[in-house]
């Protein structure tokens, strides 16, 4: 009996035309939503003038439907048993699941000012930047609508730069009509234990953002894992959002719509400093902001973002060192709301429910030559927003799953 089930499972989780896995893999049957909470800065003048703590107040959720587009350019390679694809990006605003509209205004860090002052450290260049910042009446902070902040706006300061630069700025710009990839993953035909594991991303087995093992593309994309998942396993997956591979460990048994699933969570150890977790040494890329690699809970992904000083963390700096959150008032981290988890059906390895949570932060540093940053007396890793991307198997699919998979076993 069990052998027959194993054989059926192995057959049905292969990523090729005609299998259950393939159909749901090409276009997810689950509705996926991405909720945003924006950190609205309450005291912009005091921060700029006196280097005060930044007082933030989160506003949200603002919800978008995402991952509704089918994978594109799906190409099987029979020779190495892989399938390659592009994952198109799309986001549709959901007013009924949001606290306001895309036209809501927020006071946030001026992304262009913070990034330009970080990228161009030369004193003479900073003097030029300063004159352009002044000419455009730009400041350390800015008021932007949700739509502008997420999807892009024409920056008045960058528009004055006398050589060709991208003048459109946005945390997720460009997004709609773009695609993530190319991904090339094992289809599992020759070896089911490799199914969905990424072989290459953008044609490479490494990212070229990190040193050593940190640069590796490990595991799957977290939408599914090879079947017959054990509680003792460490599940590796790659997330292009955070420009790195990461891992999840078993936390608890959960009943999801009558389906027994394993809840895997991202442990605090994954965000620890190299002092606590030596494996993380290669995620520490500089010594000053990281206080000689003793700070933890924030990941400098500037190499992956054309040099812009973007730092990724968990929402509200969950699992981050006190020095990171010390200059920011108004944060309340808690595990239940702010950690990432995956609920995996262990027989098939399918992720039937998930909550991916992350926070986007930007580093801003004092600058002698840039007046709007001149009064700062310390570095700030400024939270801009946090997001919660969730998906849960639908009732109909859950019924089908129960009858065809878990029901057969029980």
């Amino acid at each position: 009996g069990d052998l027959l089930i194993q054989k059926t499972i192995k057959k049905q989780v292969v990523l090729e035309e005609g299998t259950i896995a393939f159909k749901n893999w090409v276009k997810t049957g689950t509705e996926v939503y991405r909720q945003f909470w924006i950190f609205d800065v309450q005291n912009p003048q005091e921060v700029m003038m006196n280097s005060s703590n930044i007082q933030v107040k989160q506003r949200g959720p603002y919800t978008y439907r995402v991952r509704f587009l089918a994978k594109e350019n799906v190409t099987q390679d029979a020779e190495d048993n892989t399938v390659s694809f592009l994952q198109p990006n799309g986001a549709i605003f959901e007013p009924s699941l949001s606290v306001g509209t895309e036209a809501d205004n927020f006071t946030v860090l001026n992304l262009a000012v913070a990034a330009a002052s970080h990228i161009y450290q030369n004193q003479f260049v900073q003097m030029i930047l300063n004159s352009l910042i002044n000419k455009s009446k730009s400041s350390m902070f800015q008021v932007r609508t949700l739509r502008e902040l997420l999807w892009g706006y024409r920056d008045p300061f960058l528009s004055l730069v006398p050589y060709p630069v991208t003048t459109t700025v946005g945390l997720f710009y460009p997004y709609n009509n773009t695609a993530d990839g190319v991904y090339k993953v094992f289809n599992g035909k020759d070896n089911i234990s490799k199914v969905a594991i990424i072989d290459t991303y953008k044609g490479k087995r490494n990212l070229s953002y990190w040193e050593s093992h940190c640069d590796m593309i490990n595991g799957t994309d977290a939408a599914s894992f090879p079947p017959f998942v054990e509680k003792s396993q460490v599940l590796q997956f790659f997330s292009s959002d955070i420009c790195r591979s990461i891992y999840a460990v078993f936390e608890s048994d959960v009943n999801l719509k009558g389906i027994p699933v394993y809840r895997f969570v991202l442990p605090s150890k994954a965000f620890a400093s190299p002092v606590e977790n030596p494996d993380n040494y290669c995620f520490c890329t500089e010594k000053i902001i990281s206080k000689n690699c003793t700070s933890y809970g924030v990941l400098d992904i500037s190499k992956c973002k054309e040099g812009r000083p973007v730092y990724i963390s968990l929402p509200h700096f969950l699992y981050a060192s006190p020095d990171v959150s010390e200059p920011i008032d108004g944060l309340n981290p808690n595990e239940e709301e702010h950690r990432t988890y995956l609920d995996i059906e262990p027989i098939t390895g399918f992720t039937l429910q998930f909550a991916k949570r992350l926070q986007v932060n930007l580093l801003v540093k004092p600058s002698e030559k840039i007046q709007v940053l001149k009064n700062l007396k310390r570095n700030y890793i400024v939270p801009i927003l946090w997001l919660n991307e969730t998906g849960t198997i639908g009732d109909e699919k859950a019924n089908m799953f129960r009858s065809q998979v878990t029901g057969k076993i029980n």
Epitope: Q45, S131, I133, K135, F141, Q142, V143, L160, Q371, K374
Partner: antibody, heavy 123, light 112 residues
Framework: QVQLQQSGPELVKPGASVKISCKAS????????MNWVKQRPGQGLEWIGR????????NYNGKFKGKATLTADTSSSTAYMQLSSLTSVDSAVYFC????????????????WGQGTSVTVSS | DVVMTQTPLSLPVSLGDQASISCRSS???????????LHWYLQKPGQSPKLLIY???NRFSGVPDRFSGSGSGTDFTLKISRVEAEDLGVYFC?????????FGGGTKLEIK
């Protein structure tokens, strides 16, 4: 102290052009916008446009495009406005006014104004 | 263009009285740099306008504290707590958030 000294009154014929000047002192001329404002007798104020002397960048009120041309000479710290194809509706007092923005520390709008130049268009 | 509507057109007052002038804009004057560029000027006959209040509520240097400004978004007010003879003239509100900059039509403060 900041001073804006404008050129004297002008009496010009219809269809002609006139160029009025505004000499700045007491601040860094090249890094502050210079605005020009029109006021017809007994009327309100109308913004014509502005120039950034450092690079000659300009913004115009659509209504004055083709009528006014703004220029600046950083070596003499002087801003100029040329008005062309003059008609009676161009008879007015014209003011220059500086607009400083210094990293949020000095940010007052149009804080200092010239004394005004009267332009009379008459045949 | 942003339309600035000032009321009243004329404001007759007795010396020592309080005066209040309203200014309404056709769209929000909140600039992307977090400032609101709404200013108040006083113009006396034969003179150029003089800046009184900048960015809604800040008194320009040398302006007496009997002048105060308030408001946000699209609604703004200038108050003079005790009118003195030297305060008479035409008051203009102005916005420099959006190009082209625009002015209110003016309010003439005169003796009753």
């Amino acid at each position: 102290q900041v001073q804006l000294q404008q050129s004297g009154p002008e009496l010009v014929k219809p269809g002609a052009s006139v160029k009025i000047s505004c000499k700045a002192s007491g601040y860094t001329f090249s890094t502050s916008w210079m605005n020009w404002v029109k006021q017809r007798p007994g009327q309100g104020l109308e913004w014509i446009g502005r120039i950034y002397p450092g690079d000659g960048d300009t913004n115009y009120n659509g209504k004055f495009k083709g009528k006014a041309t703004l220029t600046a000479d950083t070596s003499s710290s002087t801003a100029y406005m040329q008005l062309s194809s003059l008609t009676s509706v161009d008879s007015a007092v014209y003011f220059c006014a500086r607009e400083v923005y210094y990293g949020g520390y000095e940010d007052y709008g149009m804080d200092y104004w010239g004394q005004g130049t009267s332009v009379t268009v008459s045949s | 263009d942003v339309v600035m509507t000032q009321t009243p057109l004329s404001l007759p007052v007795s010396l020592g009285d309080q005066a209040s002038i309203s200014c309404r804009s056709s769209q929000s004057l909140l600039h992307t740099n977090v400032n609101t560029y709404l200013h108040w000027y006083l113009q006396k006959p034969g003179q150029s306008p003089k800046l009184l209040i900048y960015k809604v509520s800040n008194r320009f240097s040398g302006v007496p504290d009997r002048f105060s400004g308030s408001g946000s978004g699209t609604d703004f007010t200038l108050k003079i707590s005790r009118v003195e003879a030297e305060d008479l003239g035409v008051y203009f509100c102005s916005q420099s958030t959006h190009v082209p900059y625009t002015f209110g039509g003016g309010t003439k403060l005169e003796i009753k």
